[in-house]
């Protein structure tokens, strides 16, 4: 923590300018008025402060705004944003996309994924929902950041906005996030023709239920292996060998390469070996001929 001293008269600060780079940490602490700093934040980023000096400026702002900075200050943080922790950012109320853009630009090239995720979260809360303008900003300035949002935040995305999401924006999304996004995509794209629909829905299919995957198998979509491997294990397990063959089309040969990886491995274990043999791929591990399969989950549900 910076020790308190009184400011020498000749060092009194009346405006934020380049002369401050020659101030020692304790001089900055003693001589810079926090209210003046806040009022002239737009000048700070143009001044080549050291990281130590930025620490002092942050400390001044923290004292002035213990409940969180106002957006007029946040908008002009510039490189001072690099000093912010997720805990700091959680106190903010951000509604302007210009503020978001400015801070996303500053964070580029720095290890700030937690801070950026928290910032985006605050923007979504501040704006009330994840609207099209916010999604457009994220996809333009922070590819992959959409997936930093919690499923609860993603639930505020209107289906009409889903069309603005690109496949690469979903690369880092986990199953719980895709569970939220997939039904929105399904609603958003439902008026498209079969082939166009599949192209659009494909990046979201990690959130699809079995019945939707089965329906796709009837539509000659020739799903690629990468998409198949991202399907939920629970969505894949009930598929028959015939359904998987129809779903993958010419890509069915890729099952051999993925034989030891989930969900393919788990799916193989649930198929009759005779059925797997019809694929001619040499897949092993299926249920031997003559064995009886009991589906206990359905029996329990009936009891």
């Amino acid at each position: 923590d910076v020790e308190r001293t009184t400011c020498p008269p000749e060092k009194e600060v009346h405006e934020i300018d380049e002369s401050l780079i020659f101030y020692k940490k304790r001089e900055l602490e003693a001589c810079v008025d926090a209210a003046l700093l806040a009022a002239q934040m737009d000048r700070v980023d143009a001044i080549p402060f050291t990281y130590e000096q930025l620490d002092v400026l942050k400390h001044k702002l923290d004292e002035l705004y213990p409940q969180g900075y106002p957006e007029s200050v946040i908008r002009h943080l510039g490189h001072l944003f690099l000093k912010m922790s997720p805990e700091d950012i959680r106190k903010w109320n951000v509604t302007s996309l210009e503020t978001l853009k400015a801070l996303l630009k500053v964070s580029k090239g720095h290890e700030m994924s937690a801070q950026v995720a928290t910032l985006i979260d605050r923007v979504v809360v501040g704006r009330g929902q994840l609207d099209k303008d916010t999604v457009d900003t994220l996809t333009a300035f922070c590819p992959g950041c959409l997936c930093s949002l919690s499923p609860e935040r993603l639930s505020s995305v209107p289906p009409s906005v889903i069309g603005a999401v690109r496949p690469q924006d979903l690369d880092t999304c986990g199953p719980r996030q895709l569970d939220v996004l997939y039904p929105k995509a399904r609603l958003a794209f439902q008026n498209m023709s079969g082939s166009e629909y599949f192209v659009k829905i494909r990046p979201f299919l990690g959130g699809a239920p079995t019945e939707d995957v089965k329906a796709l198998s009837q539509q000659n979509v020739s799903m690629d292996l990468a998409t198949f491997m991202k399907l939920r294990r629970e969505a894949v397990l009930p598929l028959t060998v015939a359904e998987v063959q129809k779903l993958l089309g010419p890509h069915v040969e890729g099952l051999k390469v993925e034989e030891q990886h989930s969900p393919v491995r788990d799916w193989i274990l649930k198929q009759r070996q005779d059925d797997l043999d019809t694929l001619g791929l040499g897949l092993q591990g299926g249920i031997p001929n003559g064995y009886l399969i009991l589906d206990l989950s359905v029996r329990e549900a009936l009891s």
Partner: antibody, heavy 122, light 107 residues
Framework: QVQLQESGPGLVKPSETLSLTCTVS????????WSWVRQPPGKGLEWIGY???????NSNPSLKSRVIISVDTSKNQFSLKLSSVTAADTAVYYC????????????????WGRGTLVTVSS | EIVMTQSPATLSVSPGERATLSCRAS??????LAWYQQKPGQAPRLLIY???TRATGIPARFSGSGSGTEFTLTISSLQSEDFAVYYC?????????FGQGTRLEIK
């Protein structure tokens, strides 16, 4: 043959929480989206919300602040909790299956429970 | 939210005759419309989806038409079991919304 059965108390006091459960028998809860729909006596239908087996939900904005929909895959059940009820929440509550086929890509219901009447009264 | 309006509220038709029920959406729902039949004390039953596709097991006398904001359910030759309440439902956007229903009664 998949069947749905609603269960829960038929009488709830004002300001309390209405709790209902829908049991899915004859098939797995994992394969579809599952909804709650209600119908006040002599009136039309109102969609309350849906749940996916993973726990992902979506509900009607008019009820969102009072609605919790949850799922228990081990029991093949999903549940509805509606808090701070008033007489206006008196209705027959149905659980229903969303048809879930991309071939017809829609959010409509091909299978319904028989419904259970919940009366809100002191 | 999309408001669905059905007309008439009650329709009186003789058995064997044709019944035409209307449903209007407050904004376009494309062809994302379903029709249900509900009899007293029973749950609704899906008749039509996609505005015009009959659900499994629904007799050919039931037909749906329309797109955008105007939709029609037609029952070509009324049977005694067809007298019930009919609801339309849009699924073009959330929240899913239903019409207030048309009661089809025997004349």
């Amino acid at each position: 043959q998949v069947q749905l059965q609603e269960s829960g108390p038929g009488l709830v006091k004002p300001s309390e929480t209405l709790s209902l459960t829908c049991t899915v028998s004859g098939g797995s809860i994992n394969n579809y989206y599952w909804s709650w729909v209600r119908q006040p006596p002599g009136k039309g239908l109102e969609w309350i919300g849906y749940i996916f087996y993973s726990g992902s939900t979506n509900s009607n904005p008019s009820l969102k602040s009072r609605v919790i929909i949850s799922v228990d895959t081990s029991k093949n059940q999903f549940s509805l909790k509606l808090s701070s009820v008033t007489a206006a929440d008196t209705a027959v509550y149905y659980c229903a299956r969303e048809v879930g086929r991309i071939a017809v890509a829609g959010w409509f219901f091909d299978l319904w429970g028989r419904g259970t009447l919940v009366t809100v009264s002191s | 939210e999309i408001v669905m309006t059905q007309s008439p509220a009650t329709l009186s038709v003789s058995p064997g005759e044709r019944a035409t029920l209307s449903c209007r959406a407050s904004q376009s729902v494309n062809s994302n419309l379903a029709w249900y039949q509900q009899k007293p004390g029973q749950a609704p039953r899906l008749l039509i989806y996609g505005a015009s596709t009959r659900a499994t097991g629904i007799p050919a006398r039931f037909s749906g038409s329309g797109s955008g904001t105007e939709f029609t359910l037609t029952i070509s030759s009324l049977q005694s079991e067809d007298f019930a309440v009919y609801y339309c439902q849009q699924y073009n956007n959330w929240p899913l919304t239903f019409g207030q229903g048309t009661r089809l009664e025997i004349k």
